[in-house]
């Protein structure tokens, strides 16, 4: 706490300007009117205040707005935002995307801090859903943002917002997250033609079921190996050699190089050796010719 001391004569601030950087902490506390500060917040960023001086300015705003700052002030916080705690931010009601952008800009280039996470959470909850413009903004600042959400949170993303998602935004998503996002992407891109559809849906295919992969295999898509290896193992296993060959096109040749990695390894073990031989890759480990394959899971379901 800064002690309440009277402002020396002639030092009362009439506006927020560079002369204030020469004020001691107690002088700032005594001589800067909180209401003046609030109306001239946009000037604070242009003045090289010390961290200690910024603490005093924050303290003045906290006194003026004990229930939380109004958006007119929040939008112009600038570097003062870095002084805010998650508890401070929880009191705010941020509704403008411009305000969100202004504050994210301050933290640009850094990891997502607890303050930023709280700000985003407040903003999204206030909007009710993660709309396209918000998603555009958030992924521009934090490409991994989408994958930081839980499957439950992702379920509130409307299909229309999926258009804003770039492939790199999904790099760190796990299968549970893609399970939620894939049906939304399928819905969002449903009116596109074959090749355009594949380009858009490709990044989401880690959530695709077997039936959809079978359908894609009929469309000459030439899926690359990196995409294939991100598919759900349980979705890949039922695919036949012919279907995988059609799905991957020329990239099927790379299966040899990745035969020890999932899901390639598990898929190979499920195929007839005769069928694998048709790929012309020397793949080994398939079911020997003449063996009968029993699907025990089907048998259990019947009994």
């Amino acid at each position: 706490e800064v002690e309440k001391t009277a402002c020396p004569s002639g030092k009362k601030a009439r506006e927020i300007d560079e002369s204030l950087i020469f004020y001691k902490k107690w002088e700032l506390e005594a001589c800067v009117d909180a209401a003046l500060l609030a109306t001239q917040m946009d000037r604070v960023n242009a003045i090289p205040f010390t961290y200690e001086q910024l603490d005093v300015l924050k303290h003045k705003l906290d006194e003026l707005y004990p229930q939380g700052y109004p958006e007119s002030v929040i939008q112009h916080l600038g570097y003062l935002f870095l002084k805010m705690s998650p508890e401070d931010i929880r009191k705010w009601n941020v509704t403008s995307l411009e305000t969100l952008k202004a504050l994210l800009e301050v933290n640009k280039g850094h990891e997502m801090s607890p303050q930023v996470a709280t700000l985003i959470d407040r903003f999204v909850k206030g909007r009710g859903q993660l709309d396209k413009d918000t998603l555009d903004t958030l992924t521009a600042f934090y490409p991994g943002y989408l994958c930081s959400l839980s499957p439950e949170e992702l379920s509130s993303v409307p299909p229309s917002s999926i258009w804003a998602v770039r492939p790199q935004d999904l790099d760190t998503c796990d299968p549970r997250q893609l399970d939620v996002l894939y049906p939304k992407a399928r819905l969002a891109f449903q009116n596109m033609n074959g090749s355009e559809y594949f380009v858009k849906i490709q990044s989401f295919l880690g959530g695709a079921p077997t039936e959809d992969l079978k359908a894609l295999s009929q469309q000459n898509v030439s899926m690359d190996l990196a995409t294939f290896m991100k598919l759900r193992t349980d979705a890949v296993l039922p695919l036949t050699v012919a279907e995988v060959q059609k799905l991957l096109g020329p990239h099927v040749e790379g299966l040899k190089a990745e035969e020890r990695h999932r899901p390639v390894r598990d898929w190979i073990l499920r195929q007839r050796q005769d069928d694998l031989d048709t790929l012309g890759l020397g793949l080994q480990g398939g079911i020997p010719n003449g063996y009968l394959v029993l699907d025990l899971s089907m048998q259990e379901a019947l009994s």
Partner: antibody, heavy 115, light 113 residues
Framework: QVQLQQPGTELVKPGASVKLSCKAS????????MHWVKQRPGQGLEWIGS????????YYNEKFKNKATLTVDKSSSTAYMQLSSLTSDDSAVYYC????????WGTGTTVTVSS | DIVMTQSPSSLTVSVGQKVTMSCKSS????????????LAWYQQKPGQSPKLLVY???TRESGVPDRFIGSGSGTDFTLIISSVQAEDLADYFC?????????FGGGTKLEII
């Protein structure tokens, strides 16, 4: 050791076709795909396409789709590439190369298109 | 198509020197599932066919001298010859096998004083 043998030169007239061969030895021919690559004098390398010798499936670079036709003869472990409607732009060295990494290259055939 | 850009286009060094050449791709060549980069380096000596030196960006082909060192990931790759020998006079090409059509870099011509 593993070898891919190609004839040294082919001299052909503009508008004609030529069929280049690539004879493989000392490995299982049907266990590796065969690729074809074009190299013009003093220029880089261009991938033409590939063929799966086991079932004859072919894949082409869009640029060469109407120019090259890839085939194989399993009985003689030989891959072929036919080039049609030849022009001076097709004058180049053509290589066959084995497998995903192109771990073995053919000796190369120099095709000269001239009247 | 993935564009491969090599630099420098040529370089002249003396025997025993270390040489570094670069290859950049227009998109990532990393398969994050297997952590493999689908990039190969080839050497082509004058009047000869190309020869595989390195695959998966850093795995040396058997029989290739250990002075040839491949490194890099994603979009930026490097081939180093730690101590150049007279027989290394050649063109060096990188190639991506991440997607079709396969594409090659324009090459780096290594000349030796």
């Amino acid at each position: 050791q593993v070898q891919l043998q190609q004839p040294g030169t082919e001299l052909v007239k503009p508008g004609a076709s030529v069929k280049l061969s690539c004879k493989a030895s000392d490995y299982t021919f049907t266990s590796y795909w065969m690729h074809w690559v074009k190299q013009r004098p003093g220029q880089g390398l261009e991938w033409i396409g590939s063929i799966n010798p086991s079932n004859g499936d072919t894949y082409y670079n869009e640029k060469f789709k109407n120019k090259a036709t890839l085939t194989v003869d399993k009985s003689s472990s030989t891959a072929y590439m036919q080039l049609s409607s030849l022009t001076s732009d097709d004058s180049a060295v053509y290589y066959c190369a084995r497998g995903w990494y192109f771990d073995v290259w053919g000796t190369g055939t120099t095709v000269t298109v001239s009247s | 198509d993935i564009v491969m850009t090599q630099s420098p286009s040529s370089l002249t060094v003396s025997v025993g020197q270390k040489v570094t050449m670069s290859c950049k791709s227009s998109q990532s060549l990393l398969n994050s599932s297997s952590q493999k980069n689908y990039l190969a380096w080839y050497q082509q000596k004058p009047g000869q066919s190309p020869k595989l030196l390195v695959y998966f960006a850093s795995t040396r082909e058997s029989g290739v001298p250990d002075r040839f060192i491949g490194s890099g990931s994603g979009t930026d790759f490097t081939l180093i010859i730690s101590s150049v020998q007279a027989e290394d006079l050649a063109d060096y090409f990188c190639q991506q096998h991440y997607s079709t059509p396969r594409t090659f870099g324009g090459g780096t011509k290594l000349e030796i004083i």
